[in-house]
């Protein structure tokens, strides 16, 4: 088979491509090359007649093409417009045509890219940086490298402009890295020099070390401050609000009780213009103190917050103990103690975590207990409960609804009827109700501290009695052993019991009968002719009860295997033959007869007077039910003796 191979397939601009012909037939008249996928005279590049060895340029000839005696076509100094399909049309000496199509793609040689940035010193958590890979080149793929790795997946990293632009939103200090871009096309790949992103950040909240806050008289106090910052932070120390010195370390020898107080370290970043401070309270004891509990969250929210209880003061070489509800700590994955047992963390607090909590410091002689601390856990509101649970009321009675939702602080309640606000109370009272008071009653519970709201909606129907139900069916004429039927009791009513009767009896137990949808739907799987019965549904509630009219199921079945009567198969010559065929079927079947395979008549009864031995043979009765689409038959042999 004639084929064209492009060497190479992807061609760089300015280079050359050879459209190499394989399996060129023998005995040729000539051949012609075309731009495109078909023989099109308007797009002929060049024609070549073998006998004359003469090449004739066509309308699409550019002067850059050379045709060879083996039909291959060389295109030199390739330009972008040369991309696409080329068709060779070969005419054999017997004027039989053959053609083959090849193609190649043209791409530019890429220059070395460079990265431009819209922000050389972005500030953490504030600025975005857009890197753009220059220059813009068509049909090029743009790739990015961070620290010589491909881009990590991050919602803060966004590629746009055909991957040419890399945007880092809300830069962080971790974005300080070496960035490179790469341009690729099928003929070249070039990578830029790296650009280092210098993210200005901080200062973070300073850390004062050591963490120890309790000292004995006569010790040296040596505090060091550090805050992550770019450029590095400048530090200042304050004691009880009074400036001390602009150094990273503070040293006070031979301290006394008078050196107790608040020690503040301030870190300042001149480029971001931000200041951050950390305060530590230093206590200098003359003797061991009574412990006390501090909490990082006085009003934690249930299932949201964690609470860290810390036993103060911090004393070196001391054992800390904890009690909850006057018991030692229970084992729980939500309770965590720090390494030194000084901090007890309750993860994801619940309303049961109120306490009381006590901590103790053990010394050589005794255990000093702190005062008990009770947690005020904010929770709820839970889903409100509306009571009483009735949904049907008779006209003329009083409607008194009460709403309650577990909540701390206690919930504030609102009532809405059909979406309209009524009152901001826990109870709703309407006297002497009428049918107009039917509707959607919504109780909304709101916890002002947690900001959470929960609602419960109740449908109230004021009616003297339930309506008469009716039965709807998804299949009025089901086919036996094939179809299922779903009866549904209408209407759908809340707080209503649904009942079913078949032929005046309660439902039989059967794997083919299934109640669903709160007993409102009765499904009969794989119906049988025995299911053709009267079905009644009933609804009842505390006010009234009612039954539907019966619905009779019309099951299509059959035809069953027919029976030919009389059963006799031997007859005497001269007798009358009177055969009757019957098959159980709904609707009634159509009957037809065949004698020895030959169609006779379309009747239920076949009558032949004064039969002879010539009437010997096979008598077949065929039955057909057009509604079920099913057929059946039976064959009987009749012998007539002389």
């Amino acid at each position: 088979k004639l084929t064209i191979e492009s060497t190479p397939f992807n061609v760089a601009e300015g280079k050359e491509v050879l459209l190499l012909v394989h399996n060129l037939p023998q005995h040729l008249f000539g051949y012609s090359w075309y731009k495109g996928e078909r023989v099109d005279g308007n797009r002929q590049i060049i024609g070549y007649v073998i006998g004359t060895q003469q090449a004739t340029p066509g309308p699409a000839y550019s002067g850059r093409e050379i045709i060879y005696p083996n039909a291959s076509l060389l295109i030199q100094n390739i330009i972008q417009n040369d991309t696409g399909f080329y068709t060779l049309h070969v005419i054999k000496s017997d004027l039989v045509n053959e053609e083959a199509t090849g193609q190649f793609r043209v791409y530019p040689e890429l220059p070395k890219p460079s990265i431009s940035s819209n922000n050389s010193k972005p500030v953490e958590d504030k600025d975005a940086v857009a890197f753009t890979c220059e220059p813009e080149t068509q049909d090029a793929t743009y790739l990015w490298w961070v620290n010589n790795q491909s881009l990590p997946v991050s919602p803060r990293l966004q590629l746009s402009n055909g991957n040419r632009t890399l945007t880092l939103f809300n830069v962080t200090r971790n974005d300080t890295a070496s960035y490179k871009c790469e341009t690729q096309n099928p003929v070249s790949a070039r990578r830029s020099d790296s650009v280092i992103l210098n993210v200005l950040y901080g200062p973070d909240a300073p850390t004062i070390s050591p963490l120890n806050t309790s000292y004995r008289s006569g010790e040296n106090l040596n505090l060091s401050c550090h805050a992550a910052s770019n450029p590095p932070a400048q530090y200042s120390w304050f004691v009880n609000g009074t400036f001390q010195q602009s150094t990273q370390e503070l040293f006070i020898p031979n301290i006394t009780v008078n050196n107790s107080g608040s020690y503040t370290c301030q870190a300042h970043n001149s480029d971001t213009g931000l200041n951050r401070t950390t305060v530590t309270t230093i206590t200098v004891y003359a003797e061991p103190p009574k412990p006390f509990i501090t909490s990082n969250n006085s009003n934690p929210v249930e299932d949201e917050d964690a609470v860290a209880l810390t036993c103060e003061p911090e004393i070196q070489n001391t054992t800390y103990l904890w009690w909850v509800n006057n018991q030692s700590l229970p084992v729980s994955p939500r309770l965590q103690l720090s390494n030194d047992n000084r901090t007890l963390t309750l993860l994801s607090v619940t309303r049961n975590d109120v306490g009381p909590y006590e901590c103790g410091i053990q010394n050589e002689l005794s255990v000093d207990h702190s005062d008990p601390v009770i947690l005020n856990v904010l929770y709820g509101p839970d889903d409100p409960t509306i009571s009483p649970s009735y949904t049907y009321y008779r006209p003329g009675v009083n409607l008194s609804l009460s709403c309650h939702a577990a909540s701390n602080p206690p919930a504030q309640y609102s009532w809405l009827i059909d979406g309209n606000i009524q009152q901001h109370t826990q109870e709703l009272f309407i006297s002497n109700i009428t049918e107009k008071n039917s509707g959607l009653y919504t109780c909304q519970a709101n916890n002002s501290a947690s900001g959470h709201s929960r609602t419960t909606v109740k449908t109230i129907t004021v009616s003297a009695e339930l309506p008469k139900p009716s039965i709807s069916s998804n299949n009025s004429k089901p086919v036996e052993d094939k179809d299922a039927v779903a009866f549904t009791c209408e209407p759908e009513a809340q707080n209503t019991t649904y009942l079913w009767w078949v032929n005046g009896q309660s439902l039989p137990v059967s794997p083919r009968l299934q109640l669903s949808n709160g007993n409102r739907t009765l499904t009969l799987f794989n119906v049988t002719r025995n299911d053709a019965r009267a079905y009644v549904c009933g609804i009842q509630n505390s006010v009234s009860a009612n039954r539907s009219d019966p619905v009779t199921l019309d099951v299509l079945y059959g035809p069953d295997t027919p029976i030919i009567s009389p059963p006799d198969s031997s007859y005497l010559s001269g007798a009358n033959l009177n055969l009757s065929c019957h098959s159980a079927s709904n609707p009634s079947p159509q009957y037809s007869w065949r004698i020895n395979g030959i169609p006779q008549q379309h009747t239920q009864v076949l009558f032949i007077a004064k039969i002879t031995p010539n009437n010997n043979g096979t008598y077949a009765c065929f039955v057909s039910n057009l509604a079920t689409g099913r057929n059946n038959s039976i064959v009987k042999s009749i012998t007539v003796s002389a």
């Epitope: 005995h27 008249f29 000539g30 012609s32 078909r38 023989v39 099109d40 005279g41 308007n42 002929q44 024609g47 007649v49 073998i50 006998g51 004359t52 003469q54 004739t56 049309h89 005419i91 054999k92 000496s93 017997d94 004027l95 039989v96 045509n97 053609e99």
Partner: antibody, heavy 117, light 107 residues
């Protein structure tokens, strides 16, 4: 502009032969193929065969195989079509036509051959 | 052999009308199809080659389209000199075959 000039009308008896000539001018004779096509009264156009003058390669339609001979004389830029064993149904206008890269592009004026006893 | 079927076999139209003639091949012939115009007593004249290419010197009101088995010749605005018989011809197979012709007459 390529021109194909054919020989004049001929009247022939059944069983005889006829030889029709076709002279090319205004273009190179040998950079194409010469086809012969006929049109009998009430019939459509019917291709008979061709020749590539430069190498003498000829091809014929199955229907005329054995009765038709197509030749070319490169020195005079003339092609010939000879049809033998003539019968009355061979009465037709016979055309020579040039075939290049896109099938037939130029036609001769036609030669009427009448076969009658 | 490849059979070529033209339709209609004859057509009446007026000057200025747009006319379309179709040609169907019994098997695919790619774009190896020509359209010819023939006037009484004259040799056929090539109008369209390779299904859609206009032969040099032919007015631009003539156009061809199609590929595979179905082809169309369109005359966008009939001129008095266009009343003639039009033939399609396939050259996919060296047994060149022609359509039976469409006679274009003045209405």
């Amino acid at each position: 502009q390529v021109q194909l000039v054919q020989s004049g009308a001929e009247v022939k008896k059944p069983g005889s032969s006829v030889k029709v000539s076709c002279k090319a001018s205004g273009g190179t004779f040998h950079d194409g193929a010469i086809s012969w096509v006929r049109e009998a009264p009430g019939q459509g156009l019917e291709w008979m065969g061709h020749i590539i003058p430069i190498d003498g390669t000829a091809g014929y339609a199955q229907k005329f195989q054995g009765r038709v001979t197509i030749t070319a004389d490169e020195s005079t830029s003339t092609a010939y079509m000879e049809l033998s064993s003539l019968r009355s149904e061979d009465t037709a206008v016979y055309y020579c036509a040039r075939y290049r890269f896109y099938g037939i592009d130029y036609w001769g004026q036609g030669t009427l051959v009448t076969v009658s006893s | 052999d490849i059979q070529m079927t033209q339709s209609p076999s004859s057509l009446s139209a007026s000057v200025g009308d747009r006319v379309t003639i179709t040609c169907r091949a019994s098997q695919s012939i790619s774009s190896y199809l020509n359209w010819y115009q023939r006037k009484p007593g004259k040799a056929p004249k090539l109008l369209i080659y390779a299904a859609s290419s206009l032969q040099s010197g032919v007015p631009s009101r003539f156009s061809g389209s199609g590929s595979g088995t179905d082809f169309t010749l369109t005359i966008s605005s009939l001129q008095p000199e266009d009343f003639a018989t039009y033939y399609c011809q396939q050259w996919r197979s060296h047994l060149f075959t022609f359509g039976q012709g469409t006679k274009l007459e003045i209405k």
